[in-house]
Interface confidence: medium
């Protein structure tokens, strides 16, 4: 598998999107997980409804939800409030008995120009201009990273 | 006048604790995050924490370097910010500055040996 | 970490002529609304750093229009466009988009 990587700035919303061959995976549950050091193991964040037929239904664990279009094909997990703890590889799982097929791995990067947070009027580099009236506008930036573009980063 | 004083450096040993303050005047200090970046001896600087402002929960950030050692903390009232370093090693050894990225202190020098 | 590469490291330049110093990124800096955060500081002798340019290419408060800055993505440029005495020390580009912020190595500028 090759890893995506999706961008957030950080106190907004990150949306991650798994794309898979909903006949596939076809009555499987869905989950999303931390990968843990480069061999460890994927925690589970958040997992899809228990019952397959409701898996339309939000599920939420702290600041993360998992909704799954299951005739679509795709998996979406909205990471809110985004924070640098949140910076890390992750998993799109498909679930089956006690194995998990991985779908797609993520590399959610956080984003924070420090300046961002000022109001206009309260910046102290006279001349800055921009506009910050969309500061609070959820974004987000996806690209495909091969596998070992980036070294691993250490897990905090 | 923008103004950024940093006190509280000197010369300890390894394992022990420090308190850095950077007293501040001349901007709006409560709505600017504030930084302690430092620059090694050899002369390359490195960002090793922020502290955000009342609206952000004055959260805070830490560089892998120092996470878990060091504490960064602020007073608006006082204009002030802080670094409570615990547990130095050699290589903490470096000027350290107060910075709103845009204005920096003068520095001060932190020396950790034996 | 977003790894940032100077060059040249050092650079010696007769007053009056133009200096270039180039800065490239591990990864792009490209943020939001088409903001660009790359900095650019100057360490003069003895003294803190300055901010000389924000975000790619906005000049700071009291900075000669001499000083500018450009790039992409991922590689960027520093342009002093007639030096003067009082321009030599360090120059750093920064980064403050993605944690940890980092620093390039710096590139010493000296006159001829």
């Known amino acids: 598998h090759n890893t995506t990587v999706f961008q957030g700035v950080e106190g907004q919303s990150l949306q991650v999107s798994c794309p898979y061959d909903s006949m596939k995976h076809w009555g499987r549950r869905k989950a999303w997980c931390r990968q843990l050091g480069e061999k460890g193991p994927c925690q589970r964040v958040v997992s899809t409804h228990n019952l397959w037929l409701l898996s339309f239904l939000r599920r939420r664990n702290g600041s993360t939800a998992i909704t799954d279009d299951t005739l679509g094909g795709t998996l979406t997990i909205t990471l809110r409030n985004l924070q640098p703890h949140d910076a890390g590889f992750y998993q799109c799982q498909s679930l089956h008995g006690s194995e998990a097929d991985t779908l797609r791995k993520v590399l959610v990067e956080v984003l924070a120009d420090p300046l961002d947070h000022r109001d206009a009027g309260d910046l102290w580099v006279p001349g800055e201009s921009e506009s910050f009236e969309d500061a609070h506008v959820e974004h987000s930036i996806s690209r495909s990273l091969l596998e070992g573009e980036i070294p691993f980063p250490p897990t905090s | 006048e923008v103004q950024l004083v940093e006190t509280g450096g000197s010369l300890v040993q390894p394992g022990k604790s420090l308190k850095l303050t950077c007293a501040t005047s001349g901007f709006p200090f409560s709505n600017v995050w504030m930084h302690w970046v430092r620059q090694s001896p050899e002369k390359q600087l490195e960002w090793i924490a922020h502290?955000?402002?009342?609206?952000?929960?004055?959260?805070?950030y830490y560089a892998e370097s120092v996470k878990g050692r060091f504490t960064i903390s602020r007073d608006d009232s006082k204009t002030s910010i802080y670094l409570q370093m615990n547990s130095l090693k050699e290589d903490d050894t470096a000027i350290y500055y107060c910075?709103?990225?845009?204005?920096w202190g003068q520095g001060v020098m932190v020396t950790v040996s034996s | 970490d977003t790894v940032l590469t100077q060059a040249p490291l050092s650079l010696s330049v007769t007053p009056g002529e133009s200096a270039s110093i180039s800065c490239r990124s591990s990864?792009?800096?490209?943020?939001?609304?088409?903001?660009?955060?790359l900095y650019w500081y100057l360490q003069k002798p003895g003294k803190s750093p300055q901010l000389l340019i924000y975000r790619m290419s906005n000049l700071a408060s009291g900075v000669p229009d001499r000083f500018s800055g450009s790039g992409s993505e991922t590689d960027f440029t520093l342009k002093i466009s007639e030096v003067e005495t009082e321009d030599v020390g360090v120059y750093y580009c920064a980064q403050f988009l993605r944690y940890p912020y980092t620093f390039g190595p710096g590139t010493k500028l000296e006159l001829k």
């Open positions: 910075t709103g990225l845009d204005y």
């Open positions: 990864k792009s800096l490209l943020g939001v609304r088409d903001i660009t955060s």
């Open positions: 502290i955000k402002a009342k609206s952000d929960n004055y959260a805070t």
